[in-house]
C-alpha cells in the first residue's frame, strides 16, 4: 500500500473579515493510525489551530466527523475571520506513539488571506478658522483594511482636488493597514456651504466607496464689510444713522456705536438675514437728536466679529438747521429701532 499523503488542494483561500474560512485537507490512507493537527505557520514557533485529540478550539469546526471510522477528510472551518488570522495553515498527520504521538507528514499548506473593509473615513480640518484666500489643510484617516491596495480621492463640492499627499502604513507586510491623507484647500468667500469629501475605494467595497466629509462652515471665517449711512429725517431735528454689516460668517458678532469716540451702545447680532451663499447681513441704527448739538458729531460703528480684532466705519454728522438726506434707504434690512437722543 502506498505511503499516506496529506493533500491540501487549495494553495490559497481568500475570505472576507467576519466570514468563515474553509481549509481543506484529506489523507490518502488510514495508515498509520493517529490524529491530525492544524497549525498556522511552520517551524518551532508554529501556532496550534486545532488538535483532533484534545483541547478546546471554539472557533474551529471540522467539516466531517473525524471520529468516524475510515474518515480521511480533515478539513476545518474557522469562524468569524479577522485580519489577524491571515497566514499559511498546515494540516499535519501524526502517528500514534508512546508516550507521545509523532509527526508523520504535513500538507503543503494553504495561505489564508483576509479581506477587511476600511473603516469609515474621518475627515478633520484645522483647529482655527481661516479667512478667504488662505490655504487650509484637511486630513483623512481610515483603518483596518486588507489587502493593502487602496485608492483615496479628495473632492470639494464634487470637483476633484489634486493638492494632497497620502500614506499607507505600514510599508511592509501586515495583517491590516491604515491610510492617512492631507489635502490643501484654498478658501473663497463662497465656501460657507462648501464641503470637502474624502473618498476611499477598496476591493472589499465592491465599487461602492466610503466617504468622509467636512463642512467648510466649520473652517471658514468671512469678515464683514461695513457701511454707515445717514437716512432721511424721521422727525423734526432727528437723524437716523444706520450701520450695515454685510456678508459675514459665522454669526457671532458684536457691534458698538461710538459718538465722538465715546461708547454709546453695544449690541449683539441677533435677528440676522442669511444670504444665498450662507453669509449673514445685519443692520443697526441710531436716532440722533441734532437740536441738542452745537458741533458736528463723529459717529463710529465698531464691529468685533468672531473674536477677531474690531473693524470700524465712521460717519460725520453735520449739525445744521436742516439736516440733508444722505445715503440710501435700506429699511428693508432694518432690524430694530435703536433711539438715541443727543443733548
Amino acid at each position: 500500500e502506498e505511503e499516506l499523503q496529506v493533500i491540501q488542494p487549495d494553495k490559497s483561500v481568500l475570505v472576507a473579515a467576519g466570514e468563515t474560512a474553509t481549509l481543506r485537507c484529506t489523507a490518502t490512507s488510514l495508515i498509520p493510525v493517529g490524529p491530525i493537527q492544524w497549525f498556522r505557520g511552520a517551524g518551532p514557533g508554529r501556532e496550534l489551530i486545532y488538535n483532533q485529540k484534545e483541547g478546546h478550539f471554539p472557533r474551529v469546526t471540522t467539516v466531517s466527523d473525524l471520529t468516524k471510522r475510515n474518515n480521511m477528510d480533515f478539513s476545518i472551518r474557522i469562524g468569524n475571520i479577522t485580519p489577524a488570522d491571515a497566514g499559511t495553515y498546515y494540516c499535519v498527520k501524526f502517528r500514534k506513539g508512546s508516550p507521545d504521538d509523532v509527526e508523520f507528514k504535513s500538507g503543503a499548506g494553504t495561505e489564508l488571506s483576509v479581506r477587511a473593509k476600511p473603516s469609515a473615513p474621518v475627515v478633520s480640518g484645522p483647529a482655527a478658522r481661516a479667512t478667504p484666500q488662505h490655504t487650509v489643510s484637511f486630513t483623512c484617516e481610515s483603518h483596518g483594511f486588507s489587502p493593502r491596495d487602496i485608492t483615496l480621492k479628495w473632492f470639494k463640492n464634487g470637483n476633484e482636488l489634486s493638492d494632497f499627499q497620502t500614506n499607507v502604513d505600514p510599508v511592509g507586510e501586515s495583517v491590516s493597514y491604515s491610510i492617512h491623507s492631507t489635502a490643501k484647500v484654498v478658501l473663497t468667500r463662497e465656501d460657507v456651504h462648501s464641503q470637502v469629501i474624502c473618498e476611499v475605494a477598496h476591493v472589499t467595497l465592491q465599487g461602492d466607496p466610503l466617504r468622509g466629509t467636512a463642512n467648510l462652515s466649520e473652517t471658514i471665517r468671512v469678515p464683514p464689510t461695513l457701511e454707515v449711512t445717514q437716512q432721511p429725517v424721521r422727525a423734526e431735528n432727528q437723524v437716523n444713522v444706520t450701520c450695515q454689516v454685510r456678508k459675514f460668517y459665522p454669526q457671532r458678532l458684536q457691534l458698538t456705536w461710538l459718538e465722538n469716540g465715546n461708547v454709546s451702545r453695544t449690541e449683539t447680532a441677533s435677528t440676522v438675514t442669511e444670504n444665498k451663499d450662507g453669509t449673514y447681513n445685519w443692520m443697526s441704527w441710531l436716532l440722533v437728536n441734532v437740536s441738542a448739538h452745537r458741533d458736528d458729531v463723529k459717529l463710529t460703528c465698531q464691529v468685533e466679529h468672531d473674536g477677531q480684532p474690531a473693524v470700524s466705519k465712521s460717519h460725520d454728522l453735520k449739525v445744521s438747521a436742516h439736516p440733508k438726506e444722505q445715503g440710501s434707504n435700506t429699511a428693508a434690512e432694518n432690524t430694530g429701532s435703536n433711539e438715541r437722543n443727543i443733548y
Epitope: 488510514l30 466527523d65 471520529t67 468516524k68 471510522r69 475510515n70
Partner: antibody, heavy 123, light 105 residues
Amino acid sequence: VTLDESGGGLQTPGGALSLVCKGSGFTFSSHAMNWVRQAPGKGLEWVAGISSDGRFTYYGAAVQGRATISRDNGQSTVRLQLNNLRAEDTATYYCTKNGGCGSGGDLDCIDAWGHGTEVIVSS
Amino acid sequence: ALTQPASVSANPGETVEITCSGGGSNNAYGWFQQKSPGSAPLTVIYDNGKRPSDIPSRFSGSKSDSTGTLTITRVQAEDEAVYYCGSADNSGAGVFGAGTTLTVL
C-alpha cells in the same frame, strides 16, 4: 456504566415514537451513541448513530428519512424519533455506547448496551 | 451484511474461533454475545481486540487483512450463546453479521 431506554410500547401504524436513552457512570459527551434493534426471532440491525458532539448523525437504510437521532449532553440523553411507523419496526430497541473510538455507525466500537425497550407496531 | 459462520461447536476447555468478513476497507470489528433472544447483548470484544473490564481474558479478538476473528480459549458451558460481529461498511453505515451460534458440547 448504565444505559436506560424508555418510550417503547404499543404503537399504531403510521404513527410516531420517541425513545429516550439516559446514560450514567461515564462522561456522556465523550462518546458516540447508536441505536440497534432486534425484531422477534431475527438478528441485530443497526438503526441510527450520532457523534459525541451531536454534529453528525447517521441512519440505517430501513429508517432513512423517517428517523431523527439527537442528543443532549447536558442531560446525558440520546433520543430516537421514528415516524410513519410500520409493522416491520416492531422490535426491541437497544441504546449502545461506543468506547473511546469511532462514531455513529461504527459498531466495532460498541462497548456497552442498554437493557432494551420493546416496541410493537400494530393496529 | 457481514459474513460469519452460522454455527460452531466445541467441547469444554477447547479453543474456538469465529470469523467475520465483509467490513469496509481497513475497518475494525466488534463482537457481541447474546445468550437468549430478547436478552440484551453483551460486548465481549470491541475495536478488534479490546476487552471490556468485566469480560474474562479467555475472550480475545484480532484482525488479519479484512477478516476479524473472535477467539475463546478454554470454552465453558456458560459461553454458549449467539455471537454477532459488528463493523461499518465503506459508506460508513453500521452492519452486523447474521450471528454465529456457539454450542458447547
